[in-house]
Interface confidence: medium
């Protein structure tokens, strides 16, 4: 029997599967949208170029059931944060950024916790990338943080580090005082300096990468990845019913495939019998669960494991 | 070799304006800031400002805006200050200053240009 | 501006023996990024400055391993084990973390 189709945003999706009684609970994150910014939310381009796979040694590594980079490295404020991309199809530079981010403090002991700049490298790392606005490469935004470096930057007008993401949160609901969620912008322009008042000079701020990777398809490689050197990027196909998630653990149900979209995977962990990932997204906190997810693991579910990146920081 | 070159001993009235130049070779100047320092006759030193030749983008110290201006030309791997309304506050030596930040820090001088005004 | 005041003026030593500077900032040089940026330069009679420690203490390449330094906040110290003859010449600290840059106002360390 073919799926029924329906609306991407509509009651009547959110209803058909709450109705199946699956793994997950749907719920409306966005009312007041454009398609156009539905589809722009989703800019990975999947099947990408990717970087050699690190040799790792798994074998004799006891993972738990269930692991929370968040709990387990609580003195690094960047594990428990979710950023907006806004009206921009940056989610590539953003799972970039986040576990980037994360990664240099887990692996300086917190001696260094900074909010790496999503502007930076969506900005300046131009065609090798992508498209900026327009979709990118996961695995090209690692690689350009170990070539090029990396500034500090925080979120949308926060006036953190040398370069703030400049494009605004947009408004996912209909009563709210954000700009209306637009499938339209232009990539902002690279600016090789940090915003006013920021010491020291932006060459001066580039946090620079040693090495990335791709991480194999195996569940058991992501997991030690995570568990020994913290979140990594991944990649996943995306469906219409994914937008309307709120609780549990997501698998597709139904829906168009609106595109490939990549997000920060900071755990694992089981849930009523299901097997997931933990996963931050970027479309602010009120999307989903505080903006967290759920996703089944260990069946490659919408690709969610063949496209895994990682690096670990210079720390010299 | 590595190494700036900076423009000969300078004698110039009070009131004129001058330009010094400082010459890279064996690096290229797009990967680094250029810095000048001024140091008056047995004083110690003094941060002028710095320029990154790759776009232009310039940051002077607050003493040091409206006297000075930096600007580059990466095709000839050349730095410039010219300075303007001399007086003798003015008569110093003026270092180049290269400098690359990151992990593969480094960090250049030029041999520094004499200024002498005089009234 | 951050005031750096650096101690001794005038240090005379014997080749052989050690030496140390002191250098204090008005404000803790202590980066939000976890870098201290605070450099030592040495100035030799009739030459252009050399910087010898960078980010509070990494050695520039070239510069020997007997001279170090260390500090925190806003108390940093250069030191030399064992003074030889090419060291003689005035000491500078310099600090890169806030705006505008400022120098110390220099050590001369003479040989005895």
């Known amino acids: 029997r073919s799926r029924p189709s329906f609306h991407p945003l509509s009651d009547e999706l959110v209803n058909y599967v709450n109705k199946r009684n699956t793994t997950w609970q749907a719920g409306h994150n966005f009312y007041n949208v454009d398609m156009s910014y539905l589809k722009r939310l989703c800019g990975t381009f999947l099947g990408g170029p990717k970087p050699p796979q690190r040799v790792m040694f798994t074998e004799d590594l006891k993972l738990p059931a269930s692991f929370d980079a968040r709990e387990q490295w609580p003195q690094c404020p960047t594990i428990k944060e979710i950023r907006d991309q806004g009206s921009c199809g940056s989610c590539w530079a953003f799972g970039a950024v986040e576990a980037i981010s994360d990664r240099i403090c887990i692996h300086t002991n917190a001696h260094v916790s900074v909010e790496v700049s999503a502007e930076d490298l969506l900005t300046c790392c131009g065609s090798m990338c992508g498209d900026g606005c327009n979709g990118g490469y996961p695995a090209e935004a690692w690689n350009f943080w170990t070539r090029k470096g990396l500034v500090s930057g925080g979120l949308y007008e926060s006036h953190v580090g040398c370069r703030p993401y400049s494009i605004p949160p947009c408004e996912h609901h209909v009563n709210g005082s954000r700009p209306p969620c637009t499938g339209e912008g232009d990539t902002p322009k690279c600016s090789k300096i940090c915003e006013p008042g920021y010491s020291p000079t932006y060459k001066q701020d580039k946090h620079y990468g040693y090495n990335s990777y791709s991480v194999s398809n195996s569940e058991k490689d992501i997991m030690a990845e995570i568990y020994k050197n913290g979140p990594v990027e991944g990649a996943f196909s995306v469906y219409s019913d994914f937008l309307l998630y709120k609780s549990g653990v997501y698998q597709h149900v139904t829906g168009e495939m609106m595109g490939g979209h990549a997000i920060r995977i900071l755990g694992w962990g089981v849930e009523n019998g299901t097997p997931y990932w933990l996963v931050a997204n970027s479309w602010n906190t009120d999307w989903g669960d505080n903006g967290f997810f759920k996703i089944l693991r260990g069946q490659d579910h919408c690709g969610i494991e063949s496209e895994v990146v990682a690096g670990i920081p210079r720390t010299d | 070799q590595v190494q700036l070159q900076q423009s000969g001993a300078e004698l110039v009235r009070s009131g004129a304006s001058i330009k010094l130049s400082c010459t890279a070779s064996?690096?290229?100047?797009?990967?680094?800031?250029m810095h000048w320092v001024k140091q008056r006759p047995e004083q110690g030193l003094e941060w002028i400002g710095w320029i990154d030749p790759e776009n232009g983008d310039t940051e002077y110290a607050p003493k040091f805006r409206g006297k000075a201006t930096m600007t580059a030309d990466t095709s000839s791997k050349t730095a410039y200050l010219q300075l303007s309304s001399l007086t003798s506050e003015d008569t110093a030596v003026y270092y180049c200053?290269?400098?690359?930040?990151?992990?593969?820090?480094?960090?250049?001088w030029g041999q520094g240009t004499s200024v002498t005004v005089s009234s | 501006d951050i005031v750096m005041t650096q101690t001794p003026l005038t240090l005379s030593v014997t080749i052989g023996q050690p030496a140390s500077i002191s250098c204090k900032s008005s404000?803790?040089?202590?980066?939000?990024?976890?870098?201290?940026?605070l450099n030592w330069l040495l100035q030799r009679p009739g030459q252009s400055p050399k910087r010898l420690i960078y980010?509070?203490?990494k050695l520039d390449s070239g510069v020997p391993d007997r001279f170090t330094g260390s500090g925190s906040g806003t108390d940093f110290t250069l030191k030399i084990s064992r003074v030889e003859a090419e060291d003689l010449g005035v000491y500078y600290c310099?600090?890169?973390?806030?705006?505008?840059?400022?120098f110390g106002g220099g050590t001369k360390l003479e040989i005895k």
């Open positions: 980010l509070l203490s």
């Open positions: 064996g690096f290229n100047i797009k990967d680094y800031y």
């Open positions: 404000q803790s040089l202590l980066y939000s990024n976890g870098k201290t940026y």
């Open positions: 310099v600090q890169g973390t806030h705006f505008p840059y400022t």
């Open positions: 200053n290269a400098r690359r930040h990151g992990y593969y820090e480094m960090d250049y």
